[in-house]
Interface confidence: low
């Protein structure tokens, strides 16, 4: 039985009748094929479902699509295939849903080989109507909406042309040829790389980075010798080939590419890679691959300029084969990230940081769990979380870790308890305090989702057999109740709930199979009658985040401030509601040396919080010294951690030093990189 199933559990009475009245079945009249589902808009209740199947004929494969629409969160569906003229839709492009609540949808159709261009179907009224548009090119990528204006679309063609539309795909214009990668920036800016001789692959490392701020009327070349580029927060990154060899380095810009600075990160060889793990407007987490096929690298965290980096975590797992990393932003609590490291003995261990990469630690062993066979000491071990890497290795892990910004403190994940990740069948664990403490929530692997901002957690057992039971909890996973949603079990394929965890509806997708037929089926369950009343003030309690000792004034200070949240009591069975807003009370902390990182040319000795001047600059520090910009080489040794809001307290001011004097080398100082404009 699941943990917590004891007499103490606050049971929901008469839930079977309440749920039975709110369970809606829909059978889709297709062969099984494949199905994709998209939510259109926020809190609109509109869902589009595209089913696709291939009929193998003697000479060719004939594809057929069906399009269904729901406007009541999946309780009822209407076949709207006629709106797209019964055309076969290319599922690899998915359904391109417009940003925010624009109500825009683009579907890309399959067209016959000889056609001049592709075909799209466009809707701007939440898929009530579609307009067919023939394109002057064959699309290579899904249509990309400008985040600022959903009427502006860009796409790459199979011939590497960059095409832009200013009227939501009605008319298209090719604004540039020989384009490898294109991305929207802020203010309707487009960044893209181009090749000169032959192809993107052949010119890798010799690409040019361009920018247009007026949808293709004018262009500026903002980088040369480019290997790749990326956008993260307010930072634009480019990896640039070195002049002298086949290594490349990261350069960063915070002004859309007008000026660039070399990042103080190691250069990488041709067989290595950089990866932006996470970025916001304050800082970036950067993974730098180790030389050789090690499967790991180092995480660095940046300063507010994206230029100076502190080593955050060694031996960070990032496989070179499938490009898998377990790096996870725990969105339910500020500053928390979870990832995996590859230890010396090649076992994989989970690490967590509560202060945005400042310090990493193992996850605390759950109280209600024993250490498994991987533990040397049966009394001392940690929780290890299964994420992308475990899923890629086909371990019995149906879902990655889950957290939601509006379900404060809740983290749900598959894990094992020992000295390292185990290949044994995992259990599901929950934390209600952002990862500080954990409890086993369910035995064995499950699919899970959060509803009503954490008021309900729903789970379905991961099984190869047909299922007809769903589990739910109204007290953050302490107690579970089971509901049989159908008499006829189905082969389960997925749980779907509206993104944002505000909904009280869950859709269970699967298929039924008998001797002659196989059909898609969905069951949508509305939990509104389980949570009968709206939550009131008495249902909430004050919770101090990151806090272990409420008596200590500094306790809970993360990045210079602490926060108190109003959280739903576990015993309260009520609706947070769709309009629920997280209530938090921040208070500023006094500054300590922990609130500062060491600037370029300085380091923290082991177990010391002071920044000490490096006696000599070596390796990539020396390169940064030589090639970095003058103004970045003048420092007092400390720099406030990005996003840190502390005030008063320690102010580590000391004399400003010009580190340019330490930049001695037999290299010639290269010319500054200038961007040329067309």
């Amino acid at each position: 039985s699941a943990p917590g199933e004891d007499e103490e559990c606050g049971r929901v009475r008469d839930f079977v009748a309440k749920l039975a009245n709110n369970t809606h079945q829909h059978v889709f009249d297709d062969l099984r094929g494949s199905v994709s589902l998209s939510w259109v808009g926020d809190s609109t209740g509109v869902i589009l479902v595209l089913t696709t199947f291939h009929v193998p004929l003697v000479i060719m494969t004939f594809g057929q699509s069906k399009l269904y629409r729901s406007e009541d969160y999946g309780k009822n569906f209407k076949d709207i295939t006629d709106l797209i003229n019964n055309t076969f839709i290319r599922t690899e492009f998915g359904m391109a849903i417009g940003p925010e609540n624009s109500g825009k949808v683009v579907l890309t159709a399959e067209v016959s080989g000889g056609s001049r261009g592709g075909r799209i179907f466009r809707s701007s009224d939440f898929a009530k109507n579609f307009v067919q548009t023939d394109l002057p090119f064959h699309p290579l990528t899904q249509m990309m909406y400008s985040p600022q204006n959903s009427d502006y679309l860009l796409a790459l063609s199979t011939e590497n042309g960059l095409w832009v539309s200013k009227n939501f795909g009605g008319k298209w214009e090719e604004i540039h040829k020989a384009v490898c990668l294109a991305k929207w920036g802020s203010d309707n800016t487009i960044f893209f790389t181009t090749y000169a001789n032959g192809s993107c692959k052949a010119d890798l490392g010799a690409l040019e980075l361009w920018r247009t701020s007026d949808l293709g009327k004018s262009f500026k070349t903002i980088g040369v010798k480019i290997y790749s580029f990326g956008l993260g927060g307010r930072f634009l990154f480019a990896s640039v080939m070195a002049d002298k060899d086949t290594t490349r380095r990261i350069h960063v810009s915070t002004d859309q590419g007008d000026t660039w600075s070399m990042a103080q990160l190691p250069s990488v060889g041709q067989e290595q890679f950089y990866s932006i793990l996470a970025a916001n407007d304050d800082m970036v987490f950067m993974h730098v691959d180790e030389p050789g096929d090690t499967g790991f690298g180092t995480i660095f965290t940046s300063d507010d300029r994206g230029i100076v980096y502190s080593k955050s975590l060694d031996r960070h797992l990032y496989t070179t084969t499938g490009g898998e990393t377990d790096f996870t932003n725990v969105t339910s609590l500020r500053g928390v990230y979870i990832t995996s490291v590859l230890s010396e003995d090649n076992s994989i261990q989970t690490m967590i940081t509560f202060d945005q990469g400042g310090r990493w630690t193992h996850l605390r062993k759950p109280e209600n769990s024993e250490c498994d066979a991987t533990a040397k000491n049966k009394n001392e071990c940690s929780l290890h979380i299964h994420a992308s890497y475990s899923i890629s290795q086909k371990l019995n892990v149906p879902m990655a870790p889950l957290s939601e910004p509006n379900a404060v403190g809740i983290v749900i994940a598959h894990g094992s308890v020992g000295d390292a990740i185990s290949v044994m069948v995992p259990d599901v664990y929950i934390s209600d305090d952002g990862g500080y403490s954990w409890t086993k929530m369910l035995e064995g692997p499950h699919y899970y989702t959060i509803l009503d901002s954490g008021g309900i957690i729903v789970a379905i057992e991961h099984s190869s057999r047909p299922i007809n039971v769903i589990k739910f909890s109204t007290d953050e996973g302490q107690c579970w109740q089971t509901y049989t949603f159908t008499r006829d079990p189905i082969y389960f394929t997925g749980l779907a709930s509206e993104p944002g965890a505000r909904s009280m509806n869950i859709s269970i997708w699967g298929f039924t199979e008998s001797f002659l037929t196989s059909q898609w089926v969905s069951y949508t369950i509305d939990f509104k009658d389980i949570l009968e009343r709206n939550c009131e003030e008495k249902d909430y309690t004050i919770w101090a985040a990151h806090s272990t000792d409420p008596e200590d004034y500094e306790d809970g200070c993360i990045l210079g401030y602490k926060e108190q949240f109003l959280r739903l009591r576990k015993s309260s069975v009520c609706q947070n509601g769709r309009d629920y807003v997280v209530t938090k009370q921040p208070s500023i902390c006094l500054c300590s040396l922990e609130d500062f990182l060491c600037d370029f040319g300085y380091y923290r000795p082991e177990n010391d919080s002071k920044c000490v001047e490096q006696p000599e600059l070596k390796g990539h520090d020396l390169e940064f010294c030589l090639y970095g910009r003058e103004e970045h080489l003048t420092t007092n040794g400390y720099r406030k951690i990005p996003g840190d809001k502390c005030q008063g307290g320690v102010n580590p001011v000391r004399e400003v030093k010009d580190l340019k004097k330490k930049c001695t080398s037999n290299f010639l100082s290269p010319e500054k990189q200038n961007s040329k404009s067309n």
Epitope: K201, Q270, E271, D289, G292, D293, T321, G323
Partner: antibody
Amino acid sequence: QVQLVQSGAEVKKPGASVKVSCKASGYTFTSRYMSWVRQAPGQGLEWMGIINPVGGSTSYAQKFQGRVTMTRDTSTSTVYMELSSLRSEDTAVYYCARDPSGIAAAGPASRYYYGMDVWGQGTTVTVSS
Amino acid sequence: EIVMTQSPATLSVSPGERATLSCRASQSVSSNLAWYQQKPGQAPRLLIYGASTRATGIPARFSGSGSGTEFTLTISSLQSEDFAVYYCQQARLGPWTFGGGTKVEIK
């Protein structure tokens, strides 16, 4: 045009050493790695190792470890391959080949290999008593 | 090390016909594979890199395909100058390794 010109044929006694040179022209010498490949009479191709002309770092195939030394002289854009403790089975044609790859190691699946795109004409080394 | 196995060892084909050469890797090499042509008394010549991209100046009748462990070199219509030995080579993991070669001879 891009060219690799190797030194002339050599006849050596068993136990001796041989040093083959490979002079590059027509491109920036330090922009590409250089591999050495050999081919015994009537046999296939065998990779011996690679050198990075920038810092001179090398990676050798296990089979030749301890017997082979690859060096370079950036002032003359020349790489050298020296093989010591010669045996009769070292009789082969030795080729240098421009190799745009990195030092022999695996990278992400997206890494792209360009192949050894320019080869020297070959140097015949005969080991006979 | 990664072992590259080519088949067949010898392929007898008439001019104008299609030739299909196979190369198998003992473990995945992704697309880090090249094909070379070698004629008697000459140095090898790069034909295909990245498993499927033709090198500069190589005629369109040569094409490469595959990724992971199985690769194919196809010569769509053999010309007299195509009779030679063909080698595949991986550059996924050191040491680089070559296949044993396939000799394409006139039938």
